[in-house]
Interface confidence: low
């Protein structure tokens, strides 16, 4: 089953209302509004390509972590080709850096670079060259990174510009859950995905109504992977005597049918010379004057 995403931060959906911090104050990153497809879109942009030694930071607002253990960061951005500037702008770069910092409280406007840990250098797959730009055809790049395990109450992300011409159009931060699942007649609850790729969270399932773990069988278990996918089912539940599997549930045998043990088999029609069974029968009684030997299976007809 596909992982479920729980969004913690969505810059594009906020309509420019988030008010992220820029550092140093009054330099570098700037919030801009553009009209695209007749809709206003907001972006953070920086383009100090002519001046060397750029160190401009953009920090998100404090994000409450909640139950997230590993977060995923999806960035949509576009980068201009350094060759589109006068003299190729010798100090121009085509990458920027992504950082994060965990904290138990919101530091507000108190920004300290030393608290941030680098996640990665973000490089575009495609750069926007002059001809594209003049035609307003910007090359949109999508990059995703993940960080975990997170342990504090919340976190910040930060973007460091080192002299590129970048427009950051979307920043989406989310965590993943393995969705509620019915499999093998067992119910598995919605589960927060683990934080470490090698370790899979083991989740015990509970048998659905009228299902049981067969004698000697393994309890139902599944593993919730980091990406929110359920993996490696172990064990199973079977419909108990008098019930058969219909889709993901156990349904009582219809009148005139029976099932004598917990198994994968469906309900069987009552054999010859038996009385009509009620709903949910585990066996069919013999008609008067007809009998079965004690060792005979319930599926055997009754005889005189």
């Amino acid at each position: 089953a596909q992982g479920k995403e729980v969004v913690l931060l969505d810059f594009a959906a906020a309509g420019g209302e988030l008010g992220w911090l820029t550092h140093p104050y009054g330099k570098g990153w700037d919030l801009m509004q553009n009209i695209m497809n007749d809709m206003p879109i907001y972006m953070y942009s920086v383009c100090n390509v002519m001046s060397g030694d750029q160190d401009n930071w953009l920090r998100t607002n404090w994000v409450y972590r909640g139950e997230a253990e590993r977060i995923f960061i999806e960035l949509k951005f576009t980068v201009r080709d350094c060759n589109s500037f006068p003299g190729g702008a010798s100090s121009c770069k085509e990458t920027f850096n992504l950082y994060y910092a965990e904290s138990d409280l919101d530091y507000g406007t108190n920004f300290q670079k030393r608290l941030f840990t680098k996640i990665d250098t973000i490089a575009p797959d495609e750069i926007t060259v002059s001809s594209d730009f003049e035609a307003r055809h910007v090359k949109l790049n999508v990059e995703e990174r993940s960080v975990g395990p997170l342990t504090r109450k919340g976190f910040y992300l930060a973007f460091q510009d080192i002299g590129a011409c970048v427009a950051l159009l979307s920043v989406r931060v989310y965590y993943k859950k393995c969705p509620e699942l019915l499999q093998g007649l067992a119910h598995f609850p919605e589960t927060i995905a683990g934080s470490d790729a090698p370790s899979l969270a083991t989740v015990a399932g509970t048998c659905v109504d009228h299902a049981v773990v067969p004698p000697g069988g393994e309890e139902p278990r599944m593993h919730c992977a980091v990406d929110g996918e359920w993996l490696v089912p172990i064990g199973q539940c079977l419909c108990q005597a008098g019930y058969e599997k219909v889709e993901d549930a156990c349904q009582a045998c219809s009148p005139g049918f029976f099932k004598f043990e917990a198994s994968e088999s469906p309900c069987l029609e009552c054999p010859e010379h038996t009385l009509p069974s009620p709903e949910g029968a585990t066996s069919c009684e013999c008609e008067e004057g007809f009998f079965r030997a004690p060792q005979d299976p319930a599926s055997m007809p009754c005889t005189r």
Partner: antibody, heavy 126, light 112 residues
């Protein structure tokens, strides 16, 4: 038509304060960065301050840093310059001008200050 | 003392061609920053005359042209007319300065 109109100038004593305003009309004010530029009597143009469209980026000339504060109210289509601790050398005609700074779309500033107000006179004298 | 250097004055007879220079350095014009030119008629606010080194805003006659080379830029006016008598300012950006914006000291053009 596109227009900028300054107001708030006047005579003030050294150490005093003034607040200049610039009312914009005829264009989408919230999409443009703005500047204040001044011109002392008989002298050339001197750039004073810059504010980006969203107020997130602000610059000042070294000569006014710490004394002047630029701000804007996009809902009112207005630009302001709060001038404190005024000195005799701040005496000038103050102009507001529409402008763009480097960003992804302009690449680098190549539009210049394309719209100017008519100016307001500030005289600092005892 | 301006970061961009302009001659204090130039003059020419009607119909003549005059040029006004604007000399910078490697941290401004020489770094690839654009140069803009403004005209200030007596008693009026400055008006954008040339932007992005050589572009004319609509309404500016083609008698005015701009160019840039190395660390310098120049404004040329051909077919000089009496109404061209004004102060002319170049403007660029300097990566070494707070706020970047720099003006030349201005040149007074006199039409003889």
């Amino acid at each position: 038509q596109v227009q900028l109109q300054e107001s708030g100038g006047g005579l003030v004593q050294p150490g005093g304060s003034l607040r200049l305003s610039c009312a914009a009309s005829g264009f989408t004010f919230s999409s443009y960065s703005m500047n204040w530029v001044r011109q002392a009597p008989g002298k050339g143009l001197e750039w004073v301050s810059y504010i980006s469209s969203s107020s997130s980026t602000i610059y000042y000339a070294d000569s006014v840093k710490g004394r002047f504060t630029i701000s804007r109210d996009n809902a009112k289509n207005s630009l302001y310059l709060q001038m404190n601790s005024l000195r005799a050398e701040d005496t000038a005609v103050y102009y507001c001008a529409r402008y763009r700074l480097p960003d992804f779309w302009s690449g680098y500033p190549n539009y210049g200050m394309d719209v100017w107000g008519q100016g307001t006179t500030v005289t600092v004298s005892s | 003392q301006s970061v961009l250097t302009q001659p204090p004055s130039v003059s020419g007879a009607p119909g003549q061609r005059v040029t006004i220079s604007c000399t910078g350095s490697s941290s401004n014009i020489g770094a690839g920053y654009d140069v803009h030119w403004y005209q200030q008629l007596p008693g009026t606010a400055p008006k954008l005359l040339i932007y992005g080194n050589s572009n004319r805003p609509s309404g500016v006659p083609d008698r005015f042209s701009g160019s840039k080379s190395g660390t310098s830029a120049s404004l040329a006016i051909t077919g000089l007319q009496a109404e061209d008598e004004a102060d002319y300012y170049c403007q660029s950006y300097d990566s070494s300065l707070s706020g970047h914006v720099v003006f030349g000291g201005g040149t007074k053009l006199t039409v003889l």
